[in-house]
Every structure is written in C-alpha cells, then in structure tokens.
C-alpha cells in the first residue's frame, strides 16, 4: 500500500499493487488497508470498516489511533505489540468495535499510552489483566492517565454469571498499576453498587464519572483517599439519601465538585441531614435542580426548598424502595 | 461439547437464495465464535463467515461479502447464514462450527455439524 504523504491531509490505503509487494516486511509509514493516515496529524483512523483485526502493519509515527466501528470482537495479548514498538501512541479509541473479549497483556509495549476509550463494547470477558498485563501482585505502573469504559455491559441476555461490577474492579485494580489513573468514566454500565476497594486504590483520581448506572447507595463506598478528585459525576441513578459519613468525607475533599441531579430522592426523615447539609455547601452545583421522588406528597418538591417538619417517617414507601 | 445441526440447504437456480440454520444445543454460550464453513467436491474446507454470541460481531471471507450475512438469535441457540446471488461455485457441503477464537482457520473451531448440501445450477 501507498506510503503516506506528510501533508496534513489524511492519505488512503491504495490497493496493493502486487503480490509481490504485500509480500515484503511492511515499510514503516505505510498506511495500512482501509485506514486513512496523516503523517503530520500523527493521527491514524480505521474508522467504520469492519475490520475483524488490529492492522499489523500501523506506522511507527502514530500518536492518535481511531479504530472505531468495527468487528474487532477479541483484543489478544499484545494486540499492539509491533516492532520497532509504537513508541508515541498516546491516544487509543477502540469504542463500538463489538468487542466482547480483552485478554492479559492487550495493550502491553504501549509505553506512552496516556487515553484508552473501550466504550460501547459489550465486554463480557474483560481479563482482570488486561490493562496491567501480569498477574504480579504489584505490576509495572501503567502509562494510562485517562480510561473511558462507558457503556460496557453486555445485554442482559449476554451478560455471563458473574458480577460484572466486580470484573471490571478486578480488572481496574490488578497489580495497582492504575494508580496514576486521574480519569475515569464508568457512566451506562447499569452498576448496582461501588465496590470499595475501587475509590481506595485509585487515590490519583480527579474525575470519575457514574452516571447512568443503577446505584442506590453510597453507604459502603469512602471517598477518603480521592485527595485530588475533582469532578464526581452521580447524575441518573438510583440514589434515595446520602448519609452523614459521605457527606462529612466530601466536604473534607478540597475542590470536589458533586452532580446528582435526576436521583429518585426520597424526603422523608433520613433526609434530614442531607437537606441541611445541601442548604450549606458549594459542593453540588447542581442542587437547586434535585427533588423529591418519594413519598408520593412529597413528588417534585425541590430539595432546598424542604424545612425539617417537611420530612417525616410515616409515609408508606413502594416494596422496591423499602428492601434496598 | 456442543452439538451443531444443520439445515436448510438444497438445489437452487444461480441468483437464488438459501437460508442455513445451526442449532446449537449442549452449552452452545461456551463456545464464543459460531462459524460456517464449506466444502466443494475435490476441494479443501474453506471458512465462509462467523459471529460472536456476545456481542454479534462478524466477519466474511472476501468472496461472499455482500451476498451472505451470518446472524444469530440468542434466544433461540441457532445461527443463520442468508445466502443470496448464489453463484455455480458457491456448491458444497456448508458445515456450522463453534469454537472459542475469532479465526479462519478449521483448527479454531473444536465442535462440528454434519453438513448441508447447497447445490447452485441451471
């Protein structure tokens, strides 16, 4: 195929021009088949093409890699692995490629891989290695600062029988080579709680976005070790109240901004605290936007707008709300 | 293991079309890939197109791009493979596979039907 041109516009793949050509070790800036290539972007798109593989024959320069819209379905063990190594790879998207397997090691020999978006894959066999590459205890820092996983969840009648909450923690937490993590979206993944040990371990957090997920209750999760965290995105769940152990560890985080608008709140006792807490803080600029869900008198009624006499226990909950 | 059954195959004039069915049965989700292959009188099996239970991603040798679609319904445990414009050198024997990689090659598929006959003539 034809090498790329250095101007800035992208330079398709050509057709091979004969057997005997294909045949030779790829050049090093060649643009591989179905691929558009910008030598002077650094930028390489292998975008909507059905693709069932990762090109092998990508060029040494590529710094942006879009392999979007694809048929990848498995990403194997160094699946990026070239030699000389893609040295300056820093942004990687792999989003709506019909993955549903990413094994150990998928992206090892990625040393300055800083962006990695696998959304929209419905990836029921995420190895817990996939993104530190070994099974060590303590594995080599991974290069990654930002890592998009939204929308991952397989459908319903796909998912295997397992916690997928718990896979993609395994996965986020192996060998702790995430830990200089500072980005992080999890939104769409239909989580029903906030596994711990996640919020401990990645203390390099500066934004974590849950949004669109089924979360009922951050009774469990601490927010202590997030420092830095800066951004805390909650929106479109299904959070009934916040208690006084999560609020008091938000207030201790010095620039954390906390949306939860579109919760299904519930005012009745146990709200108390929350409202108070509400009226008070800079913590949640989206507060004047948050109403009550239940009880039934109480629907829409804005949560700053609730005095404590307001907010009484003898309303009858629906059975879904009352067991979680 | 999984057993695979095929059917669906049959005589038809070039231009027509044929539907396949695999039903799959056993613990048809262990096996990740399903695939079609073919096998013409006097020649090798070659592979025809595959589909991934989870998550349905699919790929096509490049003679029957655009003409075949593979599918499959999980609720049923069956895959399909929609032939159309059928050509004279589409005869063979098509086989369902399953298997747990995203291959070609006969050697990724560890479970096999019995075959169906598709013959394309005037």
């Known amino acids: 195929s034809s090498p790329t041109s250095s101007a800035s516009s992208f330079s398709s793949s050509a057709p091979f021009l004969a057997s005997a050509v294909s045949a030779q070790p790829p050049l090093p800036d060649q643009c591989p088949a179905l691929c558009e290539c910008s030598e002077a972007a650094r930028t390489v798109k292998c975008v909507n093409r059905n693709l069932t593989e990762v090109p092998t024959d990508l060029p040494a320069y590529v710094r942006n890699l879009f392999l979007t819209g694809n048929q990848l379905a498995v990403l194997p063990a160094g699946a990026f692995a070239r030699r000389p190594p893609l040295a300056e790879l820093a942004a990687l998207n792999l989003s709506g490629s019909r993955l549903d397997e990413v094994r150990a090691g998928a992206f090892e020999h990625l040393p300055s891989l800083r962006q990695l978006d696998l959304s929209h894959n419905p990836l029921a066999d995420l190895s817990p290695f996939a993104f530190s590459g070994s099974n060590a205890s303590v594995s080599a820092p991974s290069p990654l600062v930002e890592l998009i996983l939204n929308h991952i969840v397989p459908p319903e009648d796909e998912r295997q029988n397992r916690s997928f909450e718990g896979m993609v923690v395994a996965a986020l937490l192996s060998g702790l080579a995430l830990r200089g993590l500072t980005r992080l979206e999890l939104a769409s993944n239909h989580f029903l709680f906030l596994p711990r040990d996640l919020l401990a371990q990645l203390p390099s957090l500066r934004y974590l976005d849950l949004r669109n997920n089924s979360l009922v209750s951050l009774t469990y999760a601490s927010f202590r070790n997030l420092t830095h965290l800066e951004s805390l995105h909650l929106e479109d769940n299904a959070l009934k109240v916040l208690h006084n152990s999560t609020l008091a560890e938000w207030h201790g985080l010095a620039h954390v901004k906390v949306f939860l608008d579109n919760n299904p709140w519930v005012c009745d006792c146990y709200m108390a605290d929350m409202v108070a807490w509400l009226k008070e803080t800079e913590v949640v600029p989206d507060k004047a936007r948050l109403t009550c869900a239940f009880p039934e008198k109480m629907r829409n009624r804005g949560l700053l707008d609730l005095n404590s006499s307001d907010l009484d226990c003898d309303a009858v909950l629906p059975q879904s709300l009352q067991t979680s | 293991e999984v057993q695979l059954v095929e059917s669906g195959g049959g005589e038809v004039q070039p231009g027509g079309s044929l539907r396949l069915s695999c039903a799959a049965s056993?613990?048809?989700?262990?096996?990740?890939?399903m695939a079609w292959f073919r096998q013409a009188p006097g020649k090798e099996r070659e592979f025809v197109a595959a589909?991934?239970?989870?998550?349905?991603?699919?790929r096509y040798t490049e003679s029957v791009k655009g003409r075949f679609t593979i599918s499959r319904d999980n609720a049923k445990n069956t895959v399909y493979l929609q032939m159309s414009s059928l050509r004279a050198e589409d005869t063979a024997v098509y086989y369902c596979a399953a298997g747990q990689a995203w291959g070609t090659k006969f050697t990724d598929y560890s479970d096999w039907g019995q075959g169906t006959l598709v013959t394309v003539k005037p």
């Open positions: 056993g613990r048809p989700f262990s096996s990740k890939t």
């Open positions: 589909v991934r239970w989870i998550g349905g991603a699919t």
